[in-house]
């Protein structure tokens, strides 16, 4: 019996087609992805093949103005339109709190939403009961397939699930649910979830009875053969893991941003054992036409976005200096504003010992593309912010050793004075440079804001200590020459859309007046 699994993950609000790098579509003839194009391909496969499941491994939420405006209603609407069969909860589904998940998505989705390792307690338990499930058995042709969900247990540090949801260890929570499916004589079981490729592989190895793992969170690109675009494969598709009980378990992920549709064909024997698995992600490029009815619906929903982008978010009573002449040479108040917003967006008081789990921000000055003049009545709009942060990136959470941070700050000024983008703006950090010293030895003082303290203060950076830092995904991926970050980071979790972070902060503050305050000094 053959099953076709179509899968997406980490779509992050890319409802419209995008450029090849998943930013805003500029030249339509070269654009990719989007739900209208995805629907065309899904329908083509559904017509051609008998047993098809369309699955999503989480993080539909967060990433473009679509989410900022529609807050998840767009996810439910278009996933319903595409007739998804199941979805696993990702960490970003909690970005607007539990209410922001329940109302727009859980109550509106016409497909099961899954996670076996999230347990509700207190008053939330009865409110959310039945709105998401640990697993679902789906009839497919003449057979049944069990789908069991999981979500990163780091979600409380990455999003806003509140205090009434407990995120358990994935493997511990999955095993009894898979065992239960076995008692129902379900012998074809897919683990669908959002904990990253390393955990996906562990689930394949450790959870008895799981036949296939469909994952997300780490934006992993797998491919067999010559890859069709810029993404470099982390391994073959499917990636085969040998389980502790000797089975070959295929593990898949489909990069991110709706650029690819994962396509996996599994052959099962009559006892539900996987005999063979093969496939590849399908690049959703312009050779695949956009479905006209879905495209018309997208255009209808778009109107509200255009109106939103010109509305006032808040006011500034000072000039927001985002000029290259400032931000690539010295501390600039636009850099301070953005870093303050990045830290504010990551306030999670999850432990009495810590006032927050993270206190530091770094931001490449070259990523700040425009100032905002206060003389336009002080008004700040989404449109203004899109000029400052035009690349559609995210502000991510990483863990780095102090020694890596020191290297990053040396890199920040290794060729100072040439208006290059690697000069770092900061938050929760005091750095002093001596430019008279040779490159690689210019950082003379580097103090960082403590987290395990009741009164935050600045202490010298410790080389062997592990620190959490918020930074643009561009830096986490080694951009602007920050190869040491990419090579040495100990953990990387993708965060919220950059413009969304700053716009939320400005809306919250209402009136802003960021200053240049001595975060970066030259001796």
């Amino acid at each position: 019996w053959e099953l076709t699994i179509l899968h997406t993950n980490d779509v992050h609000s890319r409802l419209e087609q995008t450029s090849e790098d998943s930013s805003k579509c500029v030249n339509a003839s070269r654009c990719m992805g989007g739900v209208a194009r995805l629907f065309t391909k899904v329908q083509q496969i559904r017509r051609a093949e008998p047993n098809v499941l369309l699955l999503d491994a989480g993080d539909q939420y967060q990433g473009t103005i679509w989410f900022t405006v529609y807050k998840g209603a767009e996810v439910a609407h278009f996933m319903n339109a595409l007739r998804y069969d199941a979805m696993a909860l990702g960490n970003h589904e909690f970005d607007n709190g539990v209410e922001g998940l329940i109302e727009p998505l859980l109550k509106e989705a016409k497909f099961p939403i899954l996670s076996a390792n999230i347990k509700a307690k207190g008053p939330l338990a009865s409110q959310i009961s039945g709105l998401y499930l640990p697993y679902k058995v789906l009839p497919v042709g003449d057979e049944v397939v069990g789908i069991v969900g999981y979500t990163s247990k780091e979600t409380p540090f990455l999003s806003n699930p509140g205090t009434n949801l407990v995120f358990e260890d994935e493997i511990t929570a999955l095993q009894p649910e898979v065992d239960k499916l076995k008692t129902l004589n379900v012998n074809k079981i897919i683990a669908l979830g959002h904990s990253g490729f390393e955990m996906d592989k562990l689930i394949a190895q450790k959870v008895r009875g799981v036949d296939v793992v469909v994952g997300g969170h780490s934006n992993t690109f797998l491919y067999t053969g010559n890859p069709p675009s810029k993404e470099v494969p982390a391994g073959k598709y499917p990636f085969i893991v040998t389980s502790d009980d000797g089975r070959k378990v295929p593990v898949v992920q489909a990069y991110a941003f709706g650029k690819y549709l994962g396509y996996l064909k599994i052959e099962f024997d009559e006892r539900g054992n996987v005999i063979s698995s093969h496939g590849n992600p399908i690049l959703l490029n312009s050779s695949i036409p956009e479905d006209p009815s879905i495209k018309a619906d997208i255009n209808k929903w778009r109107i509200k976005l255009d109106n939103y982008s010109t509305q006032e978010l808040g006011k500034t009573i000072v000039y927001l200096d985002g000029s290259s002449q400032s931000c690539r040479f010295r501390e600039c108040n636009m850099g301070n504003l953005i870093c303050d917003a990045m830290i504010n967006n990551n306030l999670r008081h999850t432990d009495e010992m810590f006032w927050n789990h993270v206190s530091m921000c770094i931001l490449n000055g070259g990523g700040i593309r425009s100032p905002i003049d206060e003389r336009n009545n002080g008004t700040i709009t989404w449109e203004n912010l899109a000029a400052v942060l035009p690349f559609g990136g995210t502000f991510d959470l990483v863990q780095l050793k102090g020694s890596t941070l020191k290297k990053a700050f040396e890199h920040s000024v290794h060729r100072y004075g040439q208006s290059t983008g690697e000069f770092l703006q900061v938050g929760g950090i005091h750095v002093v440079y001596d430019l008279s010293r040779k490159p690689g030895d210019r950082v003379v003082k580097l103090d960082v804001l403590c987290t395990k303290c009741r009164v935050p203060s600045y202490d010298p950076l410790k080389m062997d200590e592990v620190y959490k830092v918020i930074l643009p995904n561009f830096l986490a991926n080694g951009g602007d020459g920050f190869q040491m970050i990419k090579d040495e980071l100990l953990r990387h979790d993708s965060g919220d859309q950059d413009i969304n972070v700053v716009s939320t902060y400005i809306s919250k503050m209402k009136v802003i007046y960021p200053a240049v305050e001595g975060r970066i000094k030259f001796s």
């Epitope: 338990a125 679902k136 058995v137 003449d142 009894p176």
Partner: antibody, heavy 119, light 107 residues
Framework: QVQLVQSGAEVKKPGASVKVSCKAS????????IHWVRQAPGQGLEWMGA????????SYNQKFKGRVTMTVDTSTSTVYMELSSLRSEDTAVYYC????????????WGQGTLVTVSS | DIQMTQSPSSLSASVGDRVTITCKAS??????LAWYQQKPGKAPKLLLY???SLETGVPSRFSGSGSGKDYTLTISSLQPEDFATYYC?????????FGGGTKVEIK
């Protein structure tokens, strides 16, 4: 609205067989299990087994395996339960009930069929 | 098989009383628990599933709680139509099993 309508009461001799029907309407017949639960006079409820009309898959309570047969006719949305080698302790009201394939609580019940086993 | 032990087997109460019925499983059932109400000569009626989820149309005076092996059905203010027999049922492990029932009678 969802309805499960069962066949009428039966009186059987020990050693005989009885076949009870359950006709479903008001929902997609092939996407839910039909369970059989019995209740002896003045006693509690006992689950006998279930059939999934979508693919004919059956799960049994081992206590009844070999004596109970469940079949389905999708053309008439009807499920049948046959119990053989009847004995006096099989005298009970037999209910059919609808349940999810994966979470077997029973949200709709038939009216019940009284089966009396007596010589 | 998982044994479901319900207590008390019967109780007498008055209209307006708060009534609590408990159900203990012989092993953990991971919150896969339902409660039913049955009146004489009628089929059982689903009240709650998943421990706490109220079936559509069931009055909010019925509520459920518990985890692991121990579960409770509470009727916050007993009404005349609530005099009946109540059963718990586990649906974690085949064969699905019911408690012995609790008969709620008029005092």
């Amino acid at each position: 609205q969802v309805q499960l309508v069962q066949s009428g009461a039966e009186v059987k001799k020990p050693g005989a067989s009885v076949k009870v029907s359950c006709k479903a309407s008001g929902y997609t017949f092939t996407t839910y299990n039909i369970h059989w639960v019995r209740q002896a006079p003045g006693q509690g409820l006992e689950w006998m087994g279930a059939i999934f009309p979508g693919n004919g898959h059956i799960s049994y309570n081992q206590k009844f395996k070999g004596r109970v047969t469940m079949t389905v006719d999708t053309s008439t949305s009807t499920v049948y339960m046959e119990l053989s080698s009847l004995r006096s302790e099989d005298t009970a009201v037999y209910y059919c009930a609808r349940g999810d394939y994966d979470e077997s609580y029973f949200d709709y019940w038939g009216q019940g069929t009284l089966v009396t086993v007596s010589s | 098989d998982i044994q479901m032990t319900q207590s008390p087997s019967s109780l007498s109460a008055s209209v307006g009383d708060r009534v609590t019925i408990t159900c203990k499983a012989s092993e953990g059932i991971y919150n896969r628990l339902a409660w039913y109400q049955q009146k004489p000569g009628k089929a059982p009626k689903l009240l709650l599933y998943g421990v706490i989820s109220l079936e559509t149309g069931v009055p909010s005076r019925f509520s459920g709680s518990g985890s692991g092996k121990d579960y409770t059905l509470t009727i916050s203010s007993l009404q005349p139509e609530d005099f009946a027999t109540y059963y718990c049922q586990q649906y974690w492990s085949i064969p699905w099993t019911f408690g012995g029932g609790t008969k709620v009678e008029i005092k």
